[in-house]
Amino acid sequence: LIQERRSHEVNPAAHLTGANSSLTGSGGPLLWETQLGLAFLRGLSYHDGALVVTKAGYYYIYSKVQLGGVGCPLGLASTITHGLYKRTPRYPEELELLVSQQSPCGRATSSSRVWWDSSFLGGVVHLEAGEEVVVRVLDERLVRLRDGTRSYFGAFMV
Amino acid sequence: LIQERRSHEVNPAAHLTGANSSLTGSGGPLLWETQLGLAFLRGLSYHDGALVVTKAGYYYIYSKVQLGGVGCPLGLASTITHGLYKRTPRYPEELELLVSQQSPCGRATSSSRVWWDSSFLGGVVHLEAGEEVVVRVLDERLVRLRDGTRSYFGAFMV
Amino acid sequence: LIQERRSHEVNPAAHLTGANSSLTGSGGPLLWETQLGLAFLRGLSYHDGALVVTKAGYYYIYSKVQLGGVGCPLGLASTITHGLYKRTPRYPEELELLVSQQSPCGRATSSSRVWWDSSFLGGVVHLEAGEEVVVRVLDERLVRLRDGTRSYFGAFMV
C-alpha cells in the first residue's frame, strides 16, 4: 500500500481531551471532548468515543490516561489495562492495537495513601477509511480526568 | 484553520536534551541543551527553556523526564507533576497543555533504597507563531538530567 | 541539514511488534516481528533486531516495553533500563539515544505479589542512511511480550 502526502492536502490529525462525561461506567470505551479547549478534529471524525478515519493510511495514534486513587478499591484487580483498540466493519470484535498493563496501587506509601500514576501509549498503525479507534481502561474507576490535560487521545497521519 | 505542508518547505522539528544547567531552582521551567550531542532546532527557536514557534500549525510536542531518588525528601509532596505549558502573548499566565502526576517515591522497597521512574508526555496542540512551550516539573530536584538521553523535550509539525 | 518532504515520495515509517522470539538471552538487542499482524516496514529495513535507515533525515523513534513479574528475580537489580540505541559505521560502540530507568518491582503490594509496569520512549533523532536503531532492556527477563500489542518498536520520518 502506497500512501502519499499531497502538498495541497491537509494532513489528518486530532487531539481529544478527557471530560466529566468521559467515564460512562457502561463497559464501553472512554468518551472524549472534541471541540472545547485543546480538543480538535482535522480530517478525522468522531463517534461515541471513537476516532473515525476518513482517509486510509498509516497513523501515529496515542493516548494518555491519568490514574489515581486512595489505596485500591476493594475488589479491584491490582492490574490496570489501558489500550487502544480498532473497530472495523470486517470483524465483529475490537482488535487490540497498543496496550499497557500497570500496577499503580502499589505506589501508595506509608506517609501518603494517595497515589498517582500515568500511562502513555503511542504507535503507528494502518487504518482504512471507516475504521475506528477507541480507548479503553479497565478499571476505569481509577481514571482521573479533571481538565483535559491529564487524560487524552489523539492521532495524526505519518 | 487549514495547515498545508508545502513540498519545498522544511518541516519544523526540535529535540532538546537535559544538561547540568537544566535545573535552575528558581521556580522557572527546565532549561535545555539545544546544540550539543543529540539536540537540534529546525524551524523552531529557543529562549530561556522555551521552544518558540516560528510557523503556526499543529505540533506533536513531547517530553520525558527521568525521576530518581532515595526515599523522598521531607516536605516534598508525594506527587510529582510533569507538564508541558504554553506561553502566549494573549494571556498573562501559562496554559496547561499536557500534564502527568506520578507518585514515584513509593517505588523504593526494603531490598532497594534507590527508586527510578520515568514520565512521558506527548500530544498534538495548535501553536501560533510567537507562542512558546515550556516543561515544568514539581519537585524538580528529583529530575535526572545529566546525560541528555533520559530527560528531553521536543516537537515536530504534523 | 535541510530535509524536504517531496509530495511524490512515500514517508518512511515502521512498526515492529514483540514476539516469542524477541528475547534471546544472548545479551543482544530485542528481536521483532516485521510482517505479521500489526507489524510493517515502509521505506525502512530490518536486520537482527535493528531498524535500518535507507533515507537520511529526522525520525521520531519510539518503543514501549511491557514489564511484569512476581516479586523480583534474585540477583536482579531493582533498576530496569529500557533504551533506544544507534549503531553507526562511524563508531565501534552503540550510542544511547533515548533511555529510561524504572524500579517496577516495588509495585508488588501485600495483596498482590504480581506487578505490571510499562515503559514508553519516543523522540526525534537524526539518522543517516545505513545507520541502525535497536532496543535494549536490561534485565530482559522481565519483558512480557504476549501478542505484539504490549511491547513494540517503531519510527517515522518527520
Epitope: S110 | V70, L74, S110, R113, V114 | T79, D139
Partner: antibody, heavy 121, light 107 residues
Framework: QVQLVESGGGLVKPGGSLRLSCAAS????????MNWIRQAPGKGLEWIAD????????YYADSVKGRFTISRDNAKNSLYLQMNSLRAEDTAVYYC??????????????WGQGTTVTVSS | AIQLTQSPSSLSASVGDRVTIACRAS??????LAWFRQTPGKTPKLLIY???SLESGVPSRFLGSGSGTDFTLTISSLQPEDFAIYYC?????????FGGGTKVEIK
C-alpha cells in the same frame, strides 16, 4: 558552611549506654537521609543505621539491631544514636553522614569529624 | 547482605602513575555505587557517586566506571594527596555495605 558535628562519645563499660548526637548546620536538614557509620581502630568503614528524611523510616545493620536506636529532630537540626548493651566490639570512631538522594545527585557527601566510643571494663 | 570485594587490598605506586582499583558486588546493584578516599586521621571524602559521576570539587583525574556487579576507580595521574585508603560503597540495597578498602602506598 555545610557542617556536621558529632558529640557524646567516651569511655563506657560493657553493657553500658551512650547517646551520640550530630548537629547539622548550613543546609536544610529535613531534606536529607542521615546515616551513622563507624570505623573500628585500624579497620574499614561499617554502616550502622540510616533514617529517612520524609517519614522517619529506619534501617539498621544486623550487628546493632535491637541495641541501637537512630532518631532525628528536624526542628533542632539534630541526629541521634542511642546505644545500649554496648560490647567491646562496638569500640570505634562514629561518624554521622548526610546522604543525598535527588535525581542527579546521590551519595554521602558530608561527614562529621567523628566521635570516639571506647567500650572497656 | 551484598558483599563488596575490592582488589587489590594494597598497591604501591609513584606520583604520576595511573592506578586502577576494582570493586565487585556479590549481586547486581545497577549503578548505585560510590567511591571514597580516606587519608590517615581524616574523614572519608566522596569522590564518585552513581558509579561514574564525579563529585563537585573532585579533580578530573578520578574516573569511575562500571555497572551491575563490576566497578572500577581509575586515578589517571597519582598526586601526593592520593596516597590513602579507597573504599567502594553500595547504596542500592539494605544493609548498606562498604568494600574492605584498598591502600595506595608510595613506592
Amino acid at each position: 558552611q555545610v557542617q556536621l558535628v558529632e558529640s557524646g562519645g567516651g569511655l563506657v563499660k560493657p553493657g553500658g549506654s551512650l547517646r551520640l548526637s550530630c548537629a547539622a548546620s548550613g543546609f536544610t536538614f529535613s531534606d536529607y537521609y542521615m546515616n551513622w557509620i563507624r570505623q573500628a581502630p585500624g579497620k574499614g568503614l561499617e554502616w550502622i543505621a540510616d533514617i529517612s528524611s520524609r517519614d522517619n523510616t529506619i534501617y539498621y545493620a544486623d550487628s546493632v539491631k535491637g541495641r541501637f536506636t537512630i532518631s532525628r529532630d528536624n526542628a533542632k537540626n539534630s541526629l541521634y544514636l542511642q546505644m545500649n548493651s554496648l560490647r567491646a566490639e562496638d569500640t570505634a570512631v562514629y561518624y554521622c553522614a548526610r546522604e543525598r538522594g535527588f535525581g542527579d545527585y546521590f551519595g554521602m557527601d558530608v561527614w562529621g569529624q567523628g566521635t570516639t566510643v571506647t567500650v572497656s571494663s | 547482605a551484598i558483599q563488596l570485594t575490592q582488589s587489590p587490598s594494597s598497591l604501591s605506586a609513584s606520583v604520576g602513575d595511573r592506578v586502577t582499583i576494582a570493586c565487585r558486588a556479590s549481586q547486581d546493584i545497577s549503578s548505585a555505587l560510590a567511591w571514597f578516599r580516606q587519608t590517615p586521621g581524616k574523614t572519608p571524602k566522596l569522590l564518585i557517586y552513581d558509579a561514574s559521576s564525579l563529585e563537585s570539587g573532585v579533580p578530573s583525574r578520578f574516573l569511575g566506571s562500571g555497572s551491575g556487579t563490576d566497578f572500577t576507580l581509575t586515578i589517571s595521574s597519582l598526586q601526593p594527596e592520593d596516597f590513602a585508603i579507597y573504599y567502594c560503597q553500595q547504596f542500592n540495597t539494605y544493609p548498606l555495605t562498604f568494600g574492605g578498602g584498598t591502600k595506595v602506598e608510595i613506592k
